[in-house]
């Protein structure tokens, strides 16, 4: 999946099995990503777990759990909110669209939480003080998660210069810049282009990551996906001067 | 392993604070330079650590793109007091405290927040 | 909780080969560099060697190097110790511990050199 | 490679009362960078070795803060405030600093 880190960073991630999203005092996300095609490097996340540790007089312990084809409003006892506790309403979930959108709030910790299911894969974006981010205590265990650190070199696709490639060669000769066995249905470069450019009409990293995606799956449900995360920055992201993340002028290999 | 508090102090430095450092300035070189020294202080105890080889390579990585020179300036971390986390002896009929910003905000201004979001493939 | 379960010890003769596993679980053992530590009867601890988590760099001591070797399969979350041309003075409990300094030990498995 | 001697090797304590146990090295553990890699270890009888303090004086996560590390170049010294019938066993200085890794000898701690 694309990633943007605690710091802007804008990473394309080949990470597959469960990984550490986020991992802190008060709160530990965990996603499962698999291949997008059998034997691609390309992964999407189908699986997303949330557990909200106990705090003070707040909440209990409370898990929600999201799968793909399964967003439910609530959490996996059953309840809504943070428990019987007496501020079990600082903790909170709301269904925005049934089976496809929901928020969850977390006012204990300043924190809002975006889960979608976009197409057959789930996304994720949240919003959270500096200050819960940095409450690891134990900097050992705690702490190498992909939000904060980013995925691990030897994880990551160069999907720019991929989208670099794909523009230069055109569609026929694709799958040799592709990370991933090209898909069965996939696009033109043109057709892909086109179809973000609707979304998504500013040319940054959200835009490029729609025009990776749909040329390596084919999956137009990935238009929407770059679209919402997008979205979902505008709504979550403090400093509106961020919203769009560009490319790095850099060399490329093969160019001059 | 200390590596990881390297890379907060790396996050702490750059991120929103009332004067960030930003990707384009020399702060952010500094703040960059200073994650490095603390990486090779982590070397002898962190080598072997994917975190310690993440860092080193996000470094290089990050130095090369923002032509960083390995010489000059580096950046002090600036110092946080964490919430309290679990389970507290102290009880409170105060709603406050579980209303991060309520309670922020009698120590601080406004807390600094940060966005991470994961998508597509 | 961290684990780590050694196996593999026992009787030897002295010049012969014996293959020690060590089952890690309760952390993310491909983070990690991972070290074989040994300690003869009523002795003192000696360290024995590292690898890195990713297999790039293997660091051995003196006593060991060349005939011992330390390998993982991050996908088994399992560390080995393959020890060829056995002595009697490496008789002793031997001990995985994860990081690249140790911080958690297994319980230890007991080899015996002795003709 | 780098020696460290311990001493005494067995020390006797009455339950209650401090103990101190000292490492010297054959050289200096401090970095370039002003940092030291020491640790100490402790070894109940028939179990495993224990993290108990590193980089000189840091206690790792779970250790009593009776614990506690302090020195610097070559000597260190650990020290137990108040010596309880848990802490019998035996205790090991390591380095991290220069390869390769090597231990003490041990000191064994006793209850009189």
């Known amino acids: 999946p694309h990633l943007r880190t605690f710091t802007d960073r804008f990473q394309t991630c080949k990470v597959q099995g469960a990984w550490p999203l986020i991992d802190n005092n008060y709160l530990n996300v965990q996603v499962t990503n698999t291949p997008v095609l059998p034997g691609s490097a390309a992964t999407a996340t189908s699986k997303l777990t949330i557990i909200f540790k106990n705090f003070q007089e707040c909440v209990d312990q409370k898990v929600y759990q999201a799968e793909m084809d399964e967003l439910p409003a609530a959490f996996v006892d059953g309840s809504k909110n943070g428990g019987d506790k007496h501020g079990a309403n600082s903790l909170k979930i709301t269904e925005k669209v049934s089976g496809q959108h929901v928020e969850i709030q977390a006012k204990y910790i300043g924190t809002t939480i975006v889960v979608r299911q976009v197409g057959r894969y789930l996304t994720f974006a949240v919003r959270m003080p500096e200050e819960v981010v940095n409450a690891v205590e134990d900097w050992d265990s705690q702490g190498l998660y992909l939000c904060l650190r980013g995925c691990p070199l030897n994880q990551q696709i160069d999907f720019q210069a991929f989208h670099t490639n794909a523009e230069g060669t055109g569609a026929r000769r694709l799958a040799a810049a592709s990370p991933a066995p090209t898909a069965p249905e996939t696009f033109p470069y043109e057709t892909a282009v086109a179809k973000c450019k609707e979304k998504l009409p500013v040319e940054d990293l959200y835009y490029q990551a729609c025009v990776f995606d749909l040329l390596t799956t084919g999956d137009v449900n990935f238009t929407l996906a770059a679209y919402y995360a997008l979205e979902d920055v505008k709504m979550l992201h403090s400093n509106k001067d961020k919203l769009h993340l560009y490319e790095r002028t850099r060399d490329l290999p093969g160019r001059a | 392993c200390k590596i990881l508090k390297c890379n907060s102090e790396f996050w702490s430095a750059t991120s929103g604070s009332h004067a960030p450092a930003s990707d384009d300035t020399p702060e952010f070189c500094a703040a960059l330079r200073s994650y490095a020294l603390c990486t090779r202080r982590t070397a002898r105890t962190c080598r072997g650590d994917l975190a310690y080889h993440s860092a080193v390579h996000g470094i290089e990585d990050l130095m090369s793109q923002h032509n960083c020179s390995k010489d000059g300036p580096t950046s002090q971390p600036r110092l946080r007091t964490l919430p309290p986390a679990g389970d507290s002896q102290e009880r409170s009929d105060s709603p406050e405290i579980c209303h991060y910003e309520k309670s922020f905000h009698k120590h601080s201004a406004t807390p600094n927040y940060t966005h991470c979001g994961l998508f597509g493939d | 909780e961290v684990q780590l379960v050694e196996s593999g010890g026992g009787l030897v003769q002295p010049g012969g080969s014996l293959r020690l596993s060590c089952a890690a679980s309760g952390f993310t053992f491909s983070n990690y560099g991972m070290n074989w530590i040994r300690q003869a009867p009523g002795k003192g601890l000696e360290w024995i060697g590292m690898i890195y988590y990713d297999s790039s760099e293997k660091h051995y001591a003196d006593s060991v190097k060349g005939r011992f070797t330390i390998s993982r399969d991050n996908s088994k979350n399992t560390l080995y110790l393959q020890m060829n041309s056995l002595r009697a003075e490496d008789t002793a409990v031997y001990y995985c511990?994860?990081?690249?300094?140790?911080?958690?030990w297994g319980q230890g498995t007991m080899v015996t050199v002795s003709s | 490679d780098v020696v460290l001697t311990q001493s005494p090797l067995s020390l006797p304590v009455t339950l209650g009362q401090p103990a101190s146990i000292s490492c010297r090295s054959s050289?200096?553990?401090?970095?370039?960078?002003?940092?030291?890699?020491l640790e100490w270890f402790q070894q109940r009888p028939g179990q495993s070795p224990r993290l108990l303090i590193y980089e000189v004086s840091t206690r790792f996560s779970g250790v009593p803060d009776r614990f506690s590390g302090s020195g610097s170049g070559t000597d260190f010294t650990l020290k137990i405030s108040r010596v309880e019938a848990e802490d019998v066993g035996v205790y090991y200085c390591?380095?991290?600093?220069?390869?390769?890794?090597?231990f003490g000898q041990g000191t064994k701690l006793e209850i009189k």
């Open positions: 390591f380095q991290v600093t220069h390869d390769p890794m090597t």
């Open positions: 050289q200096s553990l401090e970095t370039s960078d002003g940092d030291t890699f």
């Open positions: 511990a994860k990081g690249t300094t140790p911080d958690y």
